[in-house]
């Protein structure tokens, strides 16, 4: 039975040019985490495996950065980066976890980062 | 260098049995999700088997869930595919495949070949 | 599970052409798509994974683009060496599925 739930930092804002970190957390499970994926609508960004580290996808190596932790960093953000970001979580024994983080690249520069919440 | 070596095939009658086995070295074997997949003569590639490399899970192609075992041997850095009650369709080569994240298939073996046939 | 169709299933053409194979997924699959290339009497060789990242190794007239369900395999000039049947594949869920296979022939 699953009994973790996934807190991410929810919907938050950043400016254009700037950086700002994707983070979730998984708690209530003692399941062990063996990978965290990290997707942005369609596309791989990255995966975090135990054992082999971090990979970043190739197309994306010069604006995203591994950590902090399991979080992923995202540079030089273009309004075009406004979306759905995704991380899953493969957990042994439990599967599979997913949290969602929406993310709006403001020109301005009034971006307030949004409430944390979680997912179950 | 990255290396897999499979062995184990041969000639078998329909209803028989095989065990694959799939010797690899030049990387730390226990690392990585690992892969069975087949090639009937003239035809496509099809997935087998596949197993996770921290939990053990195991994951079957429908055509052989409950004939086949996929297993692995960390200290012996070695992949199996045991084979019971084998049918005609199953004959192949057989290939083992290392599979980095479970996300793709970047080494192959050279494949052994299954034949079924009385 | 989830259908991977290829096209087409031949091809013939010249050295030096530009040369395109598409994959489509019965269901989205993210860029959980990969492309691999085959030779007779060879084990499939990995060129493309995710989608788009080239595999180390593999030369620069390759590439790959796509997600969702549609997907894309460009050879942008066709080599005597690039002859032979190309594989997609899908990694977003168990079963593991590959499309049908494109082989590429000399025109």
């Known amino acids: 039975m699953m009994t973790g739930t996934i807190e991410t930092t929810g919907n938050i804002s950043a400016e254009k040019g700037g950086s700002i970190i994707l983070q979730c957390h998984l708690s209530s499970t003692t399941a062990q985490v063996t990978q965290v994926n990290w997707e942005q609508q369609d596309q791989l960004l990255a995966i975090c495996n135990a054992d082999l580290g971090w990979h970043i996808s190739p197309s994306f190596k010069d604006r995203v950065a591994p950590g902090p932790g399991l979080g992923l960093t995202l540079q030089s953000l273009t309004v075009n980066d406004t979306g759905e970001y995704f991380c899953i979580y493969h957990t042994y024994p439990d599967g599979t976890y997913t949290g969602r983080i929406f993310l709006e690249v403001l020109e301005s520069s009034v971006a307030e980062h949004g409430a944390r919440f979680q997912i179950p | 260098e990255v290396q897999l070596l499979e062995s184990g095939g041969g000639l078998v009658q329909p209803g028989g049995s095989l065990r694959l086995s799939c010797a690899a070295s030049?990387?730390?074997?226990?690392?990585?999700?690992m892969n069975w997949v087949r090639q009937a003569p003239g035809k496509g590639l099809e997935w087998v088997a596949g197993?996770?490399?921290?939990?053990?899970?195991?994951y079957y192609a429908d055509s052989v869930k409950g004939r086949f075992t996929i297993s692995r041997d960390n200290s012996k850095n070695t992949l199996y595919l045991q084979m019971n009650s084998l049918r005609a369709e199953d004959t192949a080569v057989y290939y083992c495949?290392?599979?980095?994240?479970?996300?793709?298939?970047?080494?192959w073996g050279q494949g052994t070949l299954v034949t079924v046939s009385s | 599970d989830i259908q991977m169709t290829q096209s087409p299933s031949s091809l013939s053409a010249s050295v030096g052409d530009r040369v395109t194979i598409t994959c489509r997924a019965s269901?989205?699959?993210?860029?959980?798509l990969n492309w691999y290339q085959q030779k007779p009497g060879k084990a499939p060789k990995l060129l493309i994974y995710?989608?788009?990242s080239l595999q180390s190794g593999v030369p620069s007239r390759f590439s790959g683009s796509g997600s969702g369900t549609d997907f894309t395999l460009t050879i942008s000039s066709l080599q005597p060496e690039d002859f032979a049947t190309y594989y997609c594949?899908?990694?977003?869920?168990?079963?593991?599925?590959f499309g049908g296979g494109t082989k590429v022939e000399i025109k």
């Open positions: 197993i996770k490399y921290s939990s053990g899970n195991k």
């Open positions: 030049g990387f730390t074997f226990s690392s990585y999700g």
């Open positions: 269901q989205s699959i993210s860029s959980y």
């Open positions: 995710a989608a788009s």
């Open positions: 594949q899908q990694s977003y869920s168990t079963p593991l599925t």
């Open positions: 495949a290392r599979g980095p994240y479970d996300v793709w298939m970047d080494y």
